[in-house]
């Protein structure tokens, strides 16, 4: 008789999850020689320990603390790029601008990017059938708590000028319920961070509006200013051109606004 298994509303753990995390870790240490001495088996053991045998709606930041002890990776604190609802462009940007880093350019972010995982209470099994959905089931699930934890630490580490890429095509360009709006904004340290500079990425080719005047951007400016951090905003009217100019800044067409 098959044992009854909790059915959650979200997709199950990504197939071959342990192998994927381990392989990503090894690849990361090869790409980043400054992490060459990291023992990926130990990393996986700590990752696994955060959620295996635990109820997937009862995960806490404390569960991830052993793994977070590895999170002391030294990313230059003044080269941090946050993003909200525009991950692909943010990643394309840091692939070109190699001295800037998104969370997914760090080891822990790289390990978990686009993956889903959860376990089951009192068994050592990984649940490949279903995992809790943040809205329909519970917010304290392994994936949500992981991203909340690493995002908080990433924001806390930032200094000087912090950049954030925002999606100008969305109805809420700045969304208070996003990870950026609910976690990162509130964990920037005013004693370290001088300015938050928002880059609003336009979607339509003919869109010449100043999206920095959008009410949600004004809301972001208000939140940031109340935290004693300066705020600035730039429209990126042509993201394709923007990336091209990051690659080739000497190009004569890159002097005008993009």
């Amino acid at each position: 008789v098959p044992r009854w298994r909790q059915q959650w509303s979200g997709p199950g753990t990504t197939k071959r999850f342990p192998e994927t995390v381990l392989a990503r870790c090894v690849k990361y240490t090869e790409i980043h020689p400054e992490m060459r001495h990291v023992d990926c088996q130990s990393v996986w053991d700590a990752f696994k320990g955060a959620f295996i045998s635990k109820h997937p709606c009862n995960i806490t930041e404390e569960d991830y603390q052993p793994l977070m002890k590895l999170g002391t990776q030294t990313v230059p604190c003044n080269k941090i790029l946050l993003w909200s609802r525009i991950k692909d462009l943010a990643h394309q940007f840091t692939q070109v601008q190699r001295d800037m880093f998104t969370l997914e350019d760090t080891l822990l972010g790289y390990l978990a990017d686009d993956l889903t995982w959860c376990g089951e209470f009192n068994t050592s099994k990984i649940n490949y059938q279903s995992c809790p959905d943040w809205r329909k089931d519970c917010s304290n699930n392994p994936v949500s708590v992981f991203w909340k934890t690493v995002s908080r630490r990433f924001a806390e580490a930032a200094c000087d000028v912090v950049h954030v890429m925002l999606n100008g095509s969305r109805s809420k360009i700045f969304d208070k319920n996003s990870t950026f709006g609910s976690v990162e904004v509130h964990n920037l340290q005013p004693e370290k961070v001088q300015t938050l500079e928002a880059w609003v990425i336009h979607g339509g080719r003919e869109d010449s509006r100043d999206l920095c005047q959008d009410p949600t951007i004004k809301e972001l400016e208000s939140i940031i200013s109340k935290r004693n951090i300066q705020f600035s905003c730039k429209n990126i009217y042509r993201p394709d051109k923007f990336l091209q100019c990051v690659k080739n800044p000497e190009d004569s067409s890159c002097t005008s606004e993009i």
């Epitope: 020689p33 400054e34 060459r36 001495h37 990291v38 023992d39 130990s42 002890k69 002391t72 030294t74």
Partner: antibody, heavy 118, light 111 residues
């Protein structure tokens, strides 16, 4: 085969300076991280500093940070350690070492003795 | 006071097995590879074990390494007189952003 030969050691007064060199051969020097490790008389091994390959990043032990500078010249297959504001506790045999791909010190020189005394 | 803790000495008779422990924390051994070095007085230290349990070519299989949690150990089986030396464990330490060595263990072969 891999050879690492240190030079530049000697007797120096407290507060003085010394520059150690390490001549490398038998491997592609520019590909590898390089380090200095020391052993004080009657004491254990102590890592001093490392320098990365590529655009060099440097790492230092707290005990020498701000006083010692590690550098490399890939064209000359050479590693250096500039030691300033030397103290009696810096007296040691200084080894030059090549790092492997997992951070291990695969190859070591025979060492050069630095004595800091008035 | 070393960051990694080793016993100051260990001994055994010829042919015996000797184990040396190395204790650290999550900022070093916990998440990083452990390396073991053999050092005979007046010579250059020699790499014995890397990546916790891997032997470089030329190192006899009498030497073996293991790691569990925040601790590691080196075992020497079939002890020989030429194994008399100082043995050091080492690992990267995140909180210090550098390598740390154990205090060293002097291995003596008796009789």
């Amino acid at each position: 085969q891999v050879q690492l030969v240190e030079s530049g050691g000697g007797l120096v007064k407290p507060g003085g300076s010394l520059r150690l060199s390490c001549a490398a051969s038998g491997f592609t020097f520019s590909d590898d991280y390089m380090s200095w490790i020391r052993q004080a008389p009657g004491k254990g091994l102590e890592w001093v500093a490392s320098v990365s390959n590529g655009r060099p990043t440097t790492y230092y032990a707290d005990s020498v940070r701000g006083r010692f500078t590690i550098s490399r010249d890939n064209a000359k297959n050479s590693l250096y350690l500039q030691m300033n504001s030397l103290r009696a506790e810096d007296t040691a045999v200084y080894y030059c070492a090549r790092e492997g791909w997992s951070g291990e010190f695969t190859d070591w020189g025979q060492g050069t003795l630095v004595t800091v005394s008035s | 006071q070393s960051v990694l803790t080793q016993p100051p000495s260990a001994s055994g008779t010829s042919g015996q097995r000797v184990t040396i422990s190395c204790s650290g924390s999550s900022s070093n051994i916990g998440f990083h590879f452990v390396y073991w070095y053999q050092h005979l007085p007046g010579t250059a230290p020699k790499l014995l074990i890397y990546k916790n349990n891997q032997r470089p070519s030329g190192v006899p299989d009498r030497f073996s390494g293991s790691k569990s949690g925040n601790s590691a150990s080196l075992a020497i089986s079939g002890l020989r007189s030429e194994d008399e030396a100082d043995y050091y464990c080492a690992a990267w330490d995140d909180s210090l952003s550098g390598y740390v060595f154990g205090s060293g263990t002097k291995v003596t072969v008796l009789g």
